[in-house]
Amino acid sequence: APTSSSTSSSTAEAQQQQQQQQQQQQHLEQLLMDLQELLSRMENYRNLKLPRMLTFKFYLPKQATELKDLQCLEDELGPLRHVLDLTQSKSFQLEDAENFISNIRVTVVKLKGSDNTFECQFDDESATVVDFLRRWIAFCQSIISTSPQ
């Protein structure tokens, strides 16, 4: 029969696991919110009739189903910041692109872990910044919906 000490340690483990899952859920929701915020600003940019933002190419993973695939998002944060930096001077109301991207990067690292040995396999087909953001928003939504509550 399990001793009271082993029962309490397994309960503690279960609690810790539940806590980790809750944190993971929070980080995913934070990432989702940040990406949606960026996309809505892009859509606003579209309404300002400034289509040259769509000349920039972004790369998406061949397939993204796990948190480790967020490495592919992290790899593209530099180019994303470049686009935001360039567009800030043209009615793109994002106060601090560097800070915004930095926050996304921190959230991504928390979710995928700091191990950078996983090499992303990018799709040959490139995407516009709008499609890039939409794809990662869909990824977050998919992981959130399949996570145990």
């Epitope: 579209r46 009739k49 400034l50 289509p51 040259r52 000349t55 920039f56 190419k57 516009t128 939409r134």
Partner: antibody, heavy 126, light 108 residues
Framework: QVQLVQSGAEVKKPGASVKVSCKAS????????ISWVRQAPGQGLEWMGW????????NYAQKLQGRVTMTTDTSTSTAYMELRSLRSDDTAVYYC???????????????????WGQGTLVTVSS | SYELTQPPSVSVSPGQTARITCSGD??????AYWYQQKSGQAPVMVIY???KRPPGIPERFSGSSSGTMATLTITGAQVEDEADYYC???????????FGGGTKLTVL
Amino acid sequence: QVQLVQSGAEVKKPGASVKVSCKASGYTFTSYGISWVRQAPGQGLEWMGWISAYNGNTNYAQKLQGRVTMTTDTSTSTAYMELRSLRSDDTAVYYCAREGAIYYDSSGYYFPFDYWGQGTLVTVSS
Amino acid sequence: SYELTQPPSVSVSPGQTARITCSGDALPRKFAYWYQQKSGQAPVMVIYGDSKRPPGIPERFSGSSSGTMATLTITGAQVEDEADYYCYSTDSGGDVSVFGGGTKLTVL
């Protein structure tokens, strides 16, 4: 249907200025930009610059900076390109072209120069 | 200033595949566009966003891009495809546009 109608041919002396107009019809003028492209006789296409008909933002080719000015008059849906201090190597056909984006399946793509004016021949000769 | 480099001329026989290349340092991060210009006419877009065909452009026209090189391919070139072809893109900042020097396609 979309049309860009340009002003007629011009003959100018070196050092003079020329102003070419481009009247747009068949679409919402302020939803697009206008680029100006020129082509010297027997030569390739050269992008000169771009103006947003929405807010008047401009970007000019580096080599023409200081000599070219692009403007729009939204009340008449007309774009203008003025080139100053003309030289003989400015002899060319000058085109205006619509520049914007297309949206379908909720995706957007930059869609430059889907409609062009008929071209305006500017001859610079002493 | 930013440049796009194209071969001055390409020749193919009718029915053959013509490939016209365009190289530029910013192309890994910028989409390429292709225009066809026949003698005495304004240019016509045949490819946008590296590989997409505008409505009305025949299926034999296709585009691709890899690294610093974009390619326009005409599969089964026809005599009426004889024209000058220009690639077009924007610099790494996105504000300044540039055309390649143009390629004269001859379909003999």
